[in-house]
């Protein structure tokens, strides 16, 4: 229903704490360079204004849209042009163009320093002094680095953060309590970020229909006992929630997500038998829990998919009468039977089925034409299955770091023009798929591997879009989202690439590497590995292994030496010479 004051309505629905958190996230995602204090001031002003509207919905400006209110606040920031350049031009536009303009200026790779975690004692002190400000800093720092982070989910991670600090700051050994727990939250939040970015990409590039198809497949896998009408309702609501969040309408998004969680918990009987534990939790935990709830048990008596979609004499008639509904029922029926497939694979199968009907229903004898469609799915299913087997075997043999290196070599060969930092980041993220997915039961591996890889490759595409350098990457990123991963997998060595000349300074290291944390050491070594491949794109795995083993040995020796600097300056040039010889 329409409300006299949208801002009062959202404040009342969400409550002050969530309202302020969401407004802070919204501002931090739009203006990524502003400090926490600048944003906190704006948030307080907006909150005070919302309270006046709650008291009197007819008060001045209370009837304005949230975009207008928030946009006016952002545009009133001093030195906007100096700090943000052409983003300031957005302020010359009217709504809704102004908001669209802000969205287009969101930066997926802002030049901000990495979010460093303070040491335990300092963290606990500032948390105890002012928990609200501490959590505000967390929301601000994450949101500005991840401008599409799913806002209600970020509130959930902040709540997790809060609980961990409350617990660990009371312990004697704060460090050993905090580190593993906060690392766990960070890992989950980063995965959540790339997954949500993929959803927003789907929405931005291919529209609501594409996202809704994704949602139908995903929900059908999770809730195989729900009927098609129920799945369609959930998919429609979920599409609305994600559209709002991707569009910067964070208050509406969080409010509608809470409504959807409420609906699901009130209708468990027609959705799934697995929801009760989630529904017993408070709001943020409930919505998070529902988003990753385990799959319900599949009905035992499901007929073969062929009955309705191949053998039925009315296939073309049903398709003609309501294409989207018929394809939707196909996607629903196929997905509920295959929780072991990735959503990307299910969407590829639905696309193949649609293309088959488009072709066959135009023929004089359609059944003879589409009669083999299910058999034609086989190669589409085998390809990702082989990918999972090959990669998980390799991961089990090499471990995470070695597996990342194997991927780094592979991807540097596929797209050597891409910047080394981007290649290293992508390979490290892609390599984590082993730890994340290869340890799961067989039937959960494929959906985990492929949907995670798709999300990581979406980030590769977004970064590449900013500065396109590789035709290979452009080709794979230009197609549909579900075809990207197979496209990247199929890429081979880029034959058009002219190898980089060998620069000794690229492979020259100093004693400061010895004091770096293990992760930073790995990144240094992986940077060198990518540079080696750019120098010799056709180097064999054996050659690269020889060089990398030599390099690791050199670091180990020099970092243990009494006079590290001398060791690095004398042994370093020898290492460079040996590298050149090994790759000759």
């Amino acid at each position: 229903e329409a409300h006299k004051s949208e801002i009062a309505h959202r404040y009342n629905d969400l409550g002050e704490q969530h309202f302020k958190g969401l407004v802070l996230i919204a501002f931090s995602q739009y203006l990524q360079k502003c400090s926490y204090d600048e944003h906190a001031k704006l948030v307080q002003e907006v909150t005070d204004f919302a309270k006046t509207c709650v008291a009197d919905e007819s008060a001045a400006n209370c009837d304005k849209s949230l975009h207008t209110l928030f946009g006016d606040k952002l545009c009133a920031i001093p030195n906007l042009r100096e700090n943000y350049g052409e983003l300031a031009d957005c302020c010359t536009k009217q709504e809704p163009e102004r908001n669209e303009c802000f969205l287009q200026h969101k930066d997926d790779n802002p030049s901000l320093p990495p979010f460093e975690r303070p040491e335990a004692e300092a963290m606990c002190t500032s948390f105890k002094e002012n928990p609200t400000t501490f959590m505000g800093h967390y929301l601000h720092e994450v949101a500005r680095r991840h401008p599409y982070f799913y806002a209600p989910e970020l509130l959930y991670y902040a709540e997790q953060y809060n609980e961990i600090l409350t617990q660990c700051c009371a312990e004697a050994d704060k460090e050993s309590c905090l580190t593993p727990k906060l690392d766990g939250v960070k890992e989950k939040a980063l995965v959540s970020s790339v997954r949500q970015r993929m959803k927003c990409s789907s929405m931005q590039k291919f529209g609501e229909r594409a996202f809704k198809a994704w949602a139908v497949a995903r929900l059908s896998q999770t809730f195989p006992n729900a009927d098609f009408a129920e799945i369609t309702k959930l998919a429609t609501d979920l599409t609305k929630v994600n559209k709002e969040c991707c569009h910067g309408d964070l208050l509406e998004c969080a409010d509608d997500r809470a409504e959807l969680a409420k609906y699901m918990c009130e209708n468990q009987a027609t959705i799934s038998s697995k929801l009760q534990t989630c529904c017993d939790k408070p709001l943020l935990k409930k919505a998070h829990c529902l988003s990753e709830v385990e799959h319900d048990t599949m009905p035992a008596d499901l007929p073969a998919i062929a009955a309705d979609f191949v053998e039925d004499q009315e296939v073309c008639k049903n398709y003609a009468e309501a294409k989207d509904v018929f394809l939707g029922t196909f996607l629903y029926e196929y997905s509920r039977r295959h929780p072991d497939y990735s959503v990307s694979l299910l969407l590829r199968l639905a696309k193949k089925y649609e293309a088959t009907l488009e072709k066959c229903c135009a023929e004089a004898n359609p059944p003879a034409c589409y009669g083999t469609v299910l058999a034609e799915f086989q190669p589409l299913v085998e390809e990702p299955k082989n990918l999972v087997k090959t990669n998980c075997d390799l991961y089990e043999k090499l471990g995470e770091y070695g597996f990342q290196n194997a991927i780094l070599v592979r991807y540097t060969q596929k797209a050597p023009q891409v910047s080394t930092p981007t290649l290293v980041e992508a390979a490290r993220n892609l390599g984590r798929v082993g730890t994340k997915c290869c340890t799961l039961p067989e039937d959960q591996r494929l959906p985990c591997v492929e949907d995670y890889l798709s999300a990581i490759l979406n980030r590769v595409c977004l970064l590449h879009e900013k500065t396109p350098v590789s035709e290979h990457v452009t080709k794979c990123c230009s197609g549909s989202l579900v075809e990207r991963r197979p496209c990247f997998s199929a890429l081979t060595v880029d034959e058009t690439y002219v190898p980089k000349e060998f620069k000794a300074e690229t492979f020259t290291f100093h004693s400061d590497i010895c004091t770096l944390p293990e992760k930073e050491k790995q990144i240094k070594k992986q940077t060198a590995l990518a540079e080696l491949v750019k120098h010799k794109p056709k180097a064999t795995a054996e050659q690269l292994k020889t060089v990398m083993d030599d390099f690791a040995q050199f670091l180990d020796t020099c970092c243990k030496a009494a006079d590290k600097d001398t060791c690095f300056s004398t042994e370093g040039p020898n290492l460079v010479t040996r590298c050149k010889d090994a790759l000759a």
Partner: nanobody, 115 residues
């Protein structure tokens, strides 16, 4: 909404001709193969003929081959069945349908062949 409306049926003497038409709406006509099925009094549905979306391919039941001709005009969203050398056993209600489908989703048009 998909609609198929047949016309052109009637009473004819054996050996004569009739031309049936089917006006289609509610879908992209040229993207679908179309056909004709018939139902004689007291009998089940029988497939007669079908044609591809472009009109380039046609198929006929052995009982009508050489006598009946199926055609279409995609610019008018219309399907036709030219029936020559009609026989008493051709008496039936004729239904326009999607190729590969043996169903009646329309009213049909009655063709009676009798002397």
């Amino acid at each position: 909404k998909v609609q198929l409306v047949e016309s052109g049926g009637g009473l004819v003497q054996p050996g004569n001709s009739l031309r049936l038409s089917c006006a289609a709406s509610g879908f992209t006509f040229s993207s679908f193969g179309m056909g004709w099925v018939r139902q004689a009094p007291g009998k089940g549905l029988e497939w007669v003929s079908s044609i591809s979306g472009s009109g380039s391919d046609t198929l006929y039941a052995p009982s009508v081959k050489g006598r009946f001709t199926i055609s279409r005009d995609n610019s008018k969203n219309t399907l036709y069945l030219q029936m020559n050398s009609l026989r008493p056993e051709d008496t039936a209600v004729y239904y326009c349908t999607f190729a590969g489908s043996l169903s009646r989703s329309s009213q049909g048009t009655l063709v009676t062949v009798s002397s």
